[in-house]
Interface confidence: medium
């Protein structure tokens, strides 16, 4: 999958553009909006009907390093008395990002871009039922 | 930065941490992931949360399109279809990282940007404060 | 070809027991969770018993916890159902059902054949 050109005629390529090889881009891995921060309902993750767990994955070669994924608690959702209840299904919700990954070949290192995807939160749904025969 | 075990028989000029720019090859690796989520999953419709997604465009980025989440109720579908307002629909929102061409315009120079998203709506129990 | 047979059900005395099994064919039985779920006269589907692709996690509806044991028998290919203690509103079809996807839950199943009847009455 390629980084697509800017496509449109009214963008004209400004004089400006830093020079890149072929193939390849140049990245400012100085994070625009760092210090922006999440702010979700508190505890979501434990009030919600379909619950779950955050667990974080490390990996020194990509940037970020951290990346935080949500495994749902139940297989099913949590009724009005706290009971789980299997009619209905916790499911994961998913979301593309895209991290760096820094690749060595002997002493040379190189960079890759990599979309990874990542477990948000669950949500409770109401099952599809399929008849197969 | 982030440290990484180097092999010793490398010379010592590289640096242990990632450098602030980086060349990087064009291709993305990993998926060719489907990425409308009206597509990839109907959870938006069979939530007991259910969520309207809003398509976010912007040439000067990459993913140019991001699909937004926005909760239909302010409370949860109940077992008979109706809207509960004892509980709440909310968003859950995540960081993720994008491209953002800079200079803008430029075809091969982007910059690593951290946006929040709404990715999906879960229902939750209310907390209710006593303020006085 | 996917394929889900049930049998084993019947007539029991209230209080009775029965033992249904599921057949299964057509995919890797072991990589699945599998479920039983019930139809009675006039309603809809209700789920009743989960269990998942090892064995290990199992899960049961109210209606029916401490009465019902699910089961699997991976290199048989096959499901059971242990019902104890039947009651009057136990008396349904029972249909043995899976994921559709393997590996990650979407909320979506297949459920098939004809379903086996079990009746509790006196």
């Known amino acids: 999958r390629k980084i697509p050109k800017v496509g449109h005629t009214f963008f004209q390529k400004p004089e400006s553009c830093p020079p890149v090889p072929g193939g390849s881009m140049k990245l400012d891995i100085g994070i625009i909006n760092e210090n922006q921060r999440v702010s979700m309902s508190r505890n979501i993750e434990s009030r919600s009907t379909s619950p779950w767990n955050y667990t974080v994955t490390w990996d020194p070669n990509r940037y970020p390093s951290e990346v935080v994924q949500a495994q749902c608690r139940n297989l099913g959702c949590i009724n009005a008395q706290g009971k789980e209840d299997i009619s209905m299904n916790s499911v994961p919700i998913q979301q593309e990002t895209l991290v760096v990954r820094r690749k060595h070949q002997g002493c040379s290192v190189s960079f890759q871009l990599e979309k990874v995807l990542v477990t948000v939160g669950c949500t409770c749904v109401t099952p599809v039922i399929h008849h197969v025969q | 930065g982030i440290t990484i075990p180097r092999n010793p028989g490398c010379p010592n000029s590289e640096d242990k941490n990632f450098p602030r720019t980086v060349m990087v090859n064009l291709n993305i690796h990993n998926r060719n992931t489907n990425t409308n989520p009206k597509r990839s999953s109907d959870y938006y419709n069979r939530s007991t949360s259910p969520w309207n997604l809003h398509r976010n465009e912007d040439p000067e980025r990459y993913p140019s399109v991001i699909w937004e989440a926005k909760c239909r109720h302010l409370g949860c579908i109940n077992a008979d279809g109706n809207v509960d307002y004892h509980m709440n629909s909310v968003p859950i929102q995540q960081e993720i990282l994008v491209l953002r061409r800079e200079p803008p315009h430029c075809p091969n120079s982007f910059r690593l940007e951290k946006i929040l998203v709404s990715v999906g709506c879960t229902c939750v129990t209310p907390i209710v404060h006593h303020v006085a | 070809e996917v394929q889900l047979v049930e049998s084993g059900g019947g007539l029991v005395q209230p209080g009775g027991s029965l033992r249904l099994s599921c057949a299964a064919s057509?995919?890797?039985?072991?990589?699945?969770?599998m479920y039983w779920v019930r139809q009675a006269p006039g309603k809809g589907l209700e789920w009743i018993s989960a269990l998942a692709p090892g064995g290990g996690n199992r899960y049961y509806a109210e209606s029916v916890n401490g009465r019902f044991t699910i089961s699997r028998d991976n290199a048989k290919n096959s499901l059971y159902l242990q019902m104890n203690s039947l009651k009057s509103e136990d008396t349904a079809v029972y249909y043995c059902?899976?994921?559709?996807?393997?590996?990650?839950?979407?909320?979506?199943?297949?459920?098939g054949g004809q379903g086996t009847q079990v009746t509790v009455s006196s």
């Open positions: 059902a899976k994921d559709h996807n393997v590996g990650y839950r979407t909320g979506e199943y297949d459920y």
């Open positions: 057509g995919f890797t039985f072991s990589s699945y969770w």
